[in-house]
């Protein structure tokens, strides 16, 4: 941009150097050149000479008018044509910007990933503003009334060391730029309610050679949380539909889950957990792919028969991806969820 230009005159912008996108804009150029009575005053935008909507106001001043200016940034400068000078003489230059006031930040969420030492808050910023926009995260203790403020762009990590004073907080986000200011809705946070257990990992799977082969999936977590509720979803790699099983888990030992699956098929497994009774889920674990054994001997295999699972299992539900192009969006086909939460929430689908 043109930040350190030596002006021989002035340039100013109405309504201002930062304005709302789509507004009509007037840019004025006033020369103060010595030994020059300019024949013409010229305007340039991003280095290109402008031809239209230029008005000479008087001997020293000209104006260019833009209808519905919609470029996020432009570099304007103006020059004078001085008699006897071969080249145009620079008068002044300005950076101009157009954009939008911020939307109110939405979907504010704060979680503490176990062992991270931070409370991570995220939000949706809304439509692009095109201009410098600051996000100020306010964290106010409901017990001491003291408030902390953090600068951010689209998320913030706040050390839990700075949240020692109390357990209950009010959190909100303020979006500010030169065109406006908006506040998110306030979020009531209890630090004990927002902990997400340490990542759950599927370590291995094996299919037994029994008359009715079963697949055992081994999975673990380093969580110290005693009461953990988990979901495991699984499907063949050729299928769009996930089956989801629910478990109460105790991670003092490696979890084993047993399934009766279609033989000679490649399956994908993923697991996620939450503290029992809380609302924040882990993201789905990395996909674990397992190939079941070939069928040995003729068997009356019933894929719809209820799988035996080592832990207490509540239900199996079916979830399908809408399309391979929108892998994140899930749709419930049928669900018998006893726990009262949707099995489709926060899915990170694998094709």
């Amino acid at each position: 941009g043109i930040t350190s230009i030596n002006c021989s005159g002035d340039m100013w912008v109405e309504p201002g150097e930062i304005f709302q996108m789509g507004m009509n804009v007037s840019i004025y150029c006033q020369e103060a050149l010595k030994h020059c009575r300019p024949r013409n005053l010229y305007f340039y935008k991003n280095g290109f000479k402008e031809e239209f909507d230029i008005t000479r106001i008087n001997r020293t001043t000209a104006r260019i008018w833009y209808k519905g200016f919609s470029e996020p940034h432009a570099y304007m400068h103006c020059t004078a044509e001085c008699p006897g000078h071969f080249q145009e003489t620079l008068i002044c230059g300005k950076d101009i910007s157009s954009g939008h006031p911020p939307d109110a930040p939405s979907n504010l969420t704060c979680v503490i990933y176990e062992y991270s030492g931070n409370m991570t808050c995220t939000w949706n910023t809304g439509k692009p503003t095109y201009i410098d926009t600051k996000y100020i995260v306010h964290v106010k203790s409901l017990e001491t009334e003291e408030e902390q403020q953090y600068l951010a762009s689209s998320y913030v990590k706040i050390s839990t060391d700075s949240l020692q004073g109390s357990r209950k907080y009010l959190v909100w986000v303020q979006a500010v730029n030169s065109l406006g200011m908006e506040n998110s809705q306030q979020l009531h946070v209890h630090l004990d309610d927002i902990v997400i257990p340490s990542a759950s990992i599927i370590s291995r799977a094996e299919t037994t050679n029994d008359t009715v082969p079963k697949t055992i999936v081994y999975w673990k977590s380093k969580t110290m949380i005693e009461k953990v509720f988990c979901e495991m979803r699984y499907k063949t790699t050729t299928n769009q539909t996930w089956s989801v099983k629910e478990f109460d888990a105790n991670f003092t030992y490696v979890q084993q889950s047993e399934f009766y699956l279609e033989p000679d098929s490649k399956y994908v497994f993923q697991v996620r957990c939450q503290e029992t009774g809380k609302r924040n889920w882990q993201p789905w674990s990395s996909p674990f792919v397992h190939q079941t054994s070939q069928e040995t001997g003729k068997r009356n295999w019933q894929p719809w028969s209820s799988p035996f699972v080592h832990q207490t299992s509540q239900t199996v539900s079916q979830v399908t991806a809408k399309s391979s192009h929108e892998p994140q969006k899930m749709e419930m086909l049928s669900a018998t969820i006893f726990r009262g939460h949707p099995a489709s929430g926060n899915h990170q689908d694998i094709g």
């Epitope: 100020i136 403020q149 953090y150 600068l151 500010v176």
Partner: nanobody, 118 residues
Framework: QVQLQESGGGLVQPGGSLRLSCAAS????????MTWVRQAPGKGLDWVSG???????VYADSVKGRATILKDNAKNTLYLQMNSLKTEDTAVYYC????????????RGQGTQVTVSS
Amino acid sequence: QVQLQESGGGLVQPGGSLRLSCAASGFTFSSSAMTWVRQAPGKGLDWVSGIDSGGTTVYADSVKGRATILKDNAKNTLYLQMNSLKTEDTAVYYCATGLPWGNTWRTRGQGTQVTVSS
């Protein structure tokens, strides 16, 4: 209650340096966001620099590269180091709780006068 007391202002030549201090009391300074603002003669309040509760610092374009904001939690003191001073830095400097934007300034002190002149 919240109390802020600025010091360190004075007369300095263009190109010179100055360190302003702000002694804070009556609140948890270590976890508070703080801001330096200034008011030039006949002008409104302008922010100079800010530091958030986590230690992230920001500077106005007019002082970028010449100013440093520091927070000493052990001494409950906020500092502003200003180098390569210009005549346009002449103003009353105030420290305030909160960040520079969005009506987040809560309280400010009495101010300290900085005059840059040869």
